[in-house]
């Protein structure tokens, strides 16, 4: 059965041609029996809100590559399942890419995008705190504090999928001042905008600011982690909470230092450095795979502080889900 699912070619990550992963290979889904109930489940699995349509997959560019296989002939969900893997399916028999299924979900807000294109918080601990930088014509610019408000911070936090904006007096780290051109001042956001770029502002690049006035923003980013499937709270398959959705962590690069950070964060003592076999006894997860290539020094207090690929970006299946066993 499919171990991963994604939408490709849409304007945002919550619409596009349906692709599923089997045995490390991404392929498409034939539109036999594909209906709004199937899309509802897919949208739920991707954290994309309600289903809004069943467009043809051929509408999305670039089209599926010729070498790419159609993997599933038909999908039949009741609409109540959490993932497509829980729905009735048939292996492909005869289907061309002209019949690829597509999906559109109602809630494509950029807060759901794992990699917002146009804004980032730089030089902070994690991607939800830091100096505001905005991309314009392929160049990153800082934002001047003049005219900045909590309403503007709300927009940035929403755009990044980082929860609520936190009121902070913190200034940018002097050693990490922006070395980029200063983009804008006089941001006047209502707080309801989808992206910072939608807020009215002064003219591009025309201001009298210096980098002492770069804007710092902090968002809540409700991050949490848990171990599931074990006999106690200190052993099991690792799941992390991101954007309100629990997902697993891929074991690429995972080792003892990463184990220690998890055990420390959970207050579970030290890692028992379990064998590969012991780690596999908790079984594979379902749903999202949130993290891949996690790298910790071992000094971190939270897994969130470790390096990792962008949230939701991975080349893993649930057979590679990390499990951790702590001393308790």
């Amino acid at each position: 059965s499919p171990s991963g699912v994604r939408l490709v070619g849409g304007l945002h990550r919550c619409e596009g041609r349906v692709e599923v992963e089997q045995k490390g290979q991404w392929g498409t889904v034939c539109d036999d029996g594909w209906d709004i109930k199937d899309v509802a489940v897919l949208c739920r699995e991707l954290g994309c809100g309600a289903a809004s349509g069943t467009p043809s997959g051929i509408l999305y560019e670039p089209p599926a590559e010729k070498e790419q296989k159609v993997l599933i002939q038909s999908v039949s969900c009741t609409g109540t399942e959490d993932t497509l893997a829980q729905c009735e399916q048939e292996e492909v028999y005869d289907c061309s890419h002209d019949e690829d299924a597509g999906a559109s979900c109602e809630n494509p807000e950029s807060s759901f995008s794992p990699v917002p294109e146009g804004v980032r918080l730089a030089d902070g601990p994690g991607h939800c705190k830091g100096r505001v930088e905005v991309k314009h014509q392929n160049q990153w610019y800082t934002v001047c504090q003049t005219g900045w408000s909590l309403r503007a911070a709300k927009v940035v936090c929403r755009q990044l999928g980082c929860g609520r904006a936190v009121l902070t007096q913190k200034r940018c780290n002097k050693h990490a001042y922006g070395r980029k051109p200063i983009w804008l001042s006089q941001m006047s956001c209502s707080g309801r905008e989808a992206t910072l770029q939608d807020c009215p502002s002064g003219p591009w690049g025309k201001n009298t600011c210096n980098h002492d006035e770069d804007t710092w923003v902090e968002c809540e980013d409700p991050f949490d982690l848990r171990l599931v499937g074990g006999d106690n709270l200190c052993s099991g398959r690792l799941e992390v909470l991101h954007k309100g959705v629990w997902g697993s962590v891929c074991d690429d690069n995972w080792g003892e230092k990463e184990d220690q950070v998890v055990c420390k964060q959970l207050g579970c003592g030290k890692s028992l450095s379990p064998s590969f076999r012991d780690r596999k006894c908790y079984g594979p997860g379902v749903g999202r795979i949130w993290l891949d290539n996690v790298r910790c020094s071992g000094e971190e207090q939270s897994l969130e502080q470790c390096q990792h690929r962008f949230w939701g970006f991975h080349d893993c299946t649930h057979q590679e889900d990390v499990a951790v066993i702590c001393s308790g």
């Epitope: 036999d32 594909w34 599933i72 039949s76 009735e88 399916q89 048939e90 292996e91 028999y93 005869d94």
Partner: antibody, heavy 111, light 110 residues
Framework: QSVKESGGRLVTPGTPLTLTCTVS????????INWVRQAPGKGLEWIGI?????NTYYASWAKGRFTISRTSTTVDLTMTSLTTEDTATYFC????????WGPGTLVTISS | ELVLTQTPSPVSAAVGGTVSISCQAS????????CSWYQQKPGQPPKLLIH???KLASGVPSRFKGSGSGTQFTLTINDLECDDAATYYC??????????FGGGTEVEIN
């Protein structure tokens, strides 16, 4: 990719019987299996299906007397309260497009 | 409950000729399952010819053609050969995993 039925034999009315469909070359985790029967000299009659996630659906006339179950590589058809009317060749076939079919197994109900 | 009615039966035609077999559904067949056609020879299991109303199964000659939608479907066999003598069945589903077969049409080749 193939399927093959087994377990057909001569039984007396009322005797329960289980037929087995053994699959090879494909996985039941992403394929459904149908059971179909054909009385001598008659047409094809659909009995029921077990889907990749184990859900079962039956023809209205088959509900109650016929039960479909599976393991990782086999699908069983259990039949109860058999009468002479159930004498037929029983086939299994994959998915909603019914391909491939097995050679069939003959069930004869006679006193 | 879905009922599929096939006509005519039997049907006779000469080698090189054409036959058409009709399959009438009691209610509109699910728009994605459509209708399938099968060929069965004595002592053998059925063989898939056409699925989704008009798609030719792998290895089936293009002399076999399926058409139709909704409640009315047709199988046409052109350039008949002796080997086409068989019984042909249609099958359909309503998208709820409940399927049915037509009564079958015997094709005789003169």
């Amino acid at each position: 990719q193939s399927v093959k039925e087994s377990g057909g034999r001569l039984v007396t009315p009322g005797t329960p019987l289980t037929l087995t469909c053994t699959v090879s070359g494909f996985s039941l985790s992403i394929n459904a299996i149908n059971w179909v029967r054909q009385a001598p000299g008659k047409g094809l009659e659909w009995i029921g299906i077990i889907t990749n996630i184990g859900n079962t659906y039956y023809a209205s006339w088959a509900k109650g007397r016929f039960t479909i179950s599976r393991t990782s590589t086999t699908v069983d058809l259990t039949m109860t309260s058999l009468t002479t009317e159930d004498t037929a060749t029983y086939f299994c076939a994959r998915n909603s497009y019914f391909d491939p079919w097995g050679p069939g197994t003959l069930v004869t109900i006679s006193s | 409950e879905l009922v599929l009615t096939q006509t005519p039966s039997p049907v006779s035609a000469a080698v090189g000729g054409t036959v058409s077999i009709s399959c009438q559904a009691s209610q509109s067949v699910d728009s994605n399952n459509y209708c399938s056609w099968y060929q069965q020879k004595p002592g053998q299991p059925p063989k898939l010819l056409i699925h989704k109303a008009s798609k030719l199964a792998s290895g089936v000659p293009s002399r076999f053609k399926g058409s139709g939608s909704g409640t009315q479907f047709t199988l046409t066999i052109n350039d008949l050969e002796c080997d086409d003598a068989a019984t042909y069945y249609c099958a359909g589903g309503l998208g709820d995993n409940i399927y049915a077969f037509g009564g079958g049409t015997e094709v005789e080749i003169n």
